[in-house]
């Protein structure tokens, strides 16, 4: 049903869904703090621009009686229940922030006539791609896929002279929400990743993964997995690994690699870690400084969602345009705005662009070092360390198929 929006006459409201089922187990208090900080900044920015308006947020809490798994499994109905709550209370803001679960976002988008923008901290899955009024402020699976294909094809770097066309993907079903959808995208037979690879097999059991590490008949030397170093250690332990195995560990929302005094454990020597650049500092190939604030990507996405709304509100008000229009709902894309930690760029489909960083373990220093960066906005790789001190032979990444190239 059509719900009137509290979004006119100099008063603009943001509806924030505070769902019990969430992509990350972040205390709701932290999300509230992030939203409130965003509001304070937005009010200041609007005031500085000479716009004397009121901006507030309404937090919509789930009752948590039915949908209490705490993760995304029972989020589909929770999102719709919250929308029903908004509808019954006739309290819809100019914009909806949340949900973060792919299931709930997909269903809410499907089941509602969205004439307002929806901003999500999450919704990583491919099913949330190309949604006209949805903006995603954490790297979705599509961006990861494009990096992997780009990297697989690269063959003109001093440390990667072979194109790859094969891979194993380890996916055992216990992944976090982000990892679940990242791996789901790699697994999907119709995805860009699958389309571009000649061979891809999903390993679902620990033993399958462990066996591949020393299997002379393996079909690929490359294994993609998702999680932190501890997750890898639990799986791999101190088992011997064939010297031409390359493990790609996707760990986007973890900045521990950039902290002072971090030493890479020995089991990480065959591993390339894919993570996100730690914000507004220029990366160099070794980390002598403490570049990184605490891990806070999820709450930060909520905060940036508020700042994004403020950015769009300012533009529309300055142009004398109406906020409760399809034009406003479709405007949250193809732009750069000033986020909390620096500029944030959204692509043509409203998905955040970022700098991904591929790290390796230096055999000399036992430190994580930047091998290359990848700009998701232009789909381009930039080598950083031209002479990496790899564990692999000749300081080059091996071919992906055993028996060809350096062993």
């Amino acid at each position: 049903s059509q719900v009137s929006q509290n979004c006119h006459n100099g008063s603009y409201e943001i509806s924030v869904l505070m769902m019990g089922n969430s992509a990350f187990a972040e205390p709701l208090k932290n999300l509230e703090d992030a939203v409130n900080e965003g509001l304070e900044i937005v009010r200041g920015r609007l005031q500085n621009a000479g716009l004397n308006v009121t901006v507030n947020a309404t937090f919509m809490y789930s009752d948590g009686l039915i949908h209490n798994s705490g993760d995304c499994r029972s989020s589909t109905c929770e999102g719709l229940d919250l929308l029903r709550k908004i509808s019954n209370a006739q309290r819809m803001g100019c914009v909806l922030i949340g949900p973060s679960c792919t299931y709930s976002t997909f269903q809410m988008y499907l089941d509602t006539e969205l004439s307002y923008p929806m901003i999500s901290a999450g919704s990583f899955g491919l099913s949330c791609d190309y949604k006209e009024t949805l903006t995603r402020l954490m790297s979705p699976a599509r961006k990861l896929m494009y990096f992997l294909v780009n990297f697989w094809k690269t063959n003109d770097l001093p440390f990667k002279t072979y194109s790859w066309s094969t891979s194993y993907v380890y996916k055992n079903g216990t992944e976090t929400e982000d990892c679940f959808w990242y791996l789901n995208a790699l697994e999907a037979s119709v995805s860009y990743f699958s389309h571009e690879l000649g061979f891809k097999v999903v390993l679902r059991q620990d033993k399958e993964f462990q066996d591949i590490l020393m299997d002379h008949n393996r079909k690929s030397n490359v294994i993609i997995m998702c999680g932190g170093p501890e997750f890898l250690y639990k799986l791999k332990g101190d088992r011997a690994v064939a010297e031409d195995i390359v493990i790609i560990l996707v760990d986007l929302f973890n900045d521990q690699y950039f902290e002072d005094n971090v030493t890479a454990p020995d089991y990480m020597k065959n591993v390339l870690v894919l993570t996100l650049s730690p914000g507004n500092s220029l990366l160099n190939s070794s980390f002598s400084r403490n570049l990184s604030p605490t891990k806070r990507d999820f709450a930060l996405a909520y905060l940036n969602g508020i700042l994004l709304f403020g950015h769009m509100l300012k533009i529309f008000l300055e142009n004398g345009e109406n906020i409760t229009t399809p034009k406003f709902a479709h405007a949250f894309r193809n732009l750069t705005f000033e986020g909390y930690d620096g500029p944030v760029t959204l692509d043509d489909w409203g998905d955040v662009d970022s700098t991904m960083v591929l790290l390796y373990t230096s055999v000399d220093t036992k430190k994580y070092k930047v091998l290359l960066t990848y700009d998701t906005h232009v789909n381009k790789t930039y080598p950083v360390d031209m002479s990496p001190t790899f564990t692999w032979k000749n300081s080059k990444l091996p071919n992906d198929i055993t028996g060809r190239g350096p062993q």
Epitope: D33, E37, G38, N280
Partner: nanobody, 115 residues
Framework: EVQLVESGGGLVQPGGSLRLTCAAS????????MTWVRQAPGKGLEWVAK????????YYPDSVKGRFTVSRDNAKNSLYLQMDNLRAEDTAMYYC????????WGQGTLVTVSS
């Protein structure tokens, strides 16, 4: 050790000025937004100034706008609050805090405005 230490508080007459300093250590100060927060006797917390990591944005509530000025020197890991035309209602304990969730606080410095 990660810490914030405020200084510069004291007793001042109405209409007078004070400059508070917050010295940061143990973390990369230049990467964080910083906020000055105050608590008057028997009252709740109120933010009075906010500044972006590079000093490029500064915000104040209406209650102090035009009288308080926040600044920072990232080279010195220091945050400042210049308070002019002080009023009795500015009497409070002043704290500097880090980041959106105010995950780090100093011990505070007391400002008393009285004739």
């Amino acid at each position: 050790e990660v810490q914030l230490v405020e200084s510069g508080g004291g007793l001042v007459q109405p209409g007078g000025s004070l400059r508070l300093t917050c010295a940061a250590s143990g973390f990369t100060f230049s990467r964080y937004w910083m906020t000055w927060v105050r608590q008057a006797p028997g009252k709740g917390l109120e933010w009075v100034a906010k500044i972006r990591h590079d000093g490029g944005e500064k915000y104040y509530p209406d209650s102090v706008k035009g009288r308080f000025t926040v600044s920072r020197d990232n080279a010195k890991n220091s945050l400042y609050l210049q308070m002019d035309n002080l009023r009795a209602e500015d009497t409070a304990m002043y704290y500097c805090t880090r980041d959106y969730n105010k995950d780090l606080w100093g011990q505070g410095t007391l400002v008393t405005v009285s004739s």
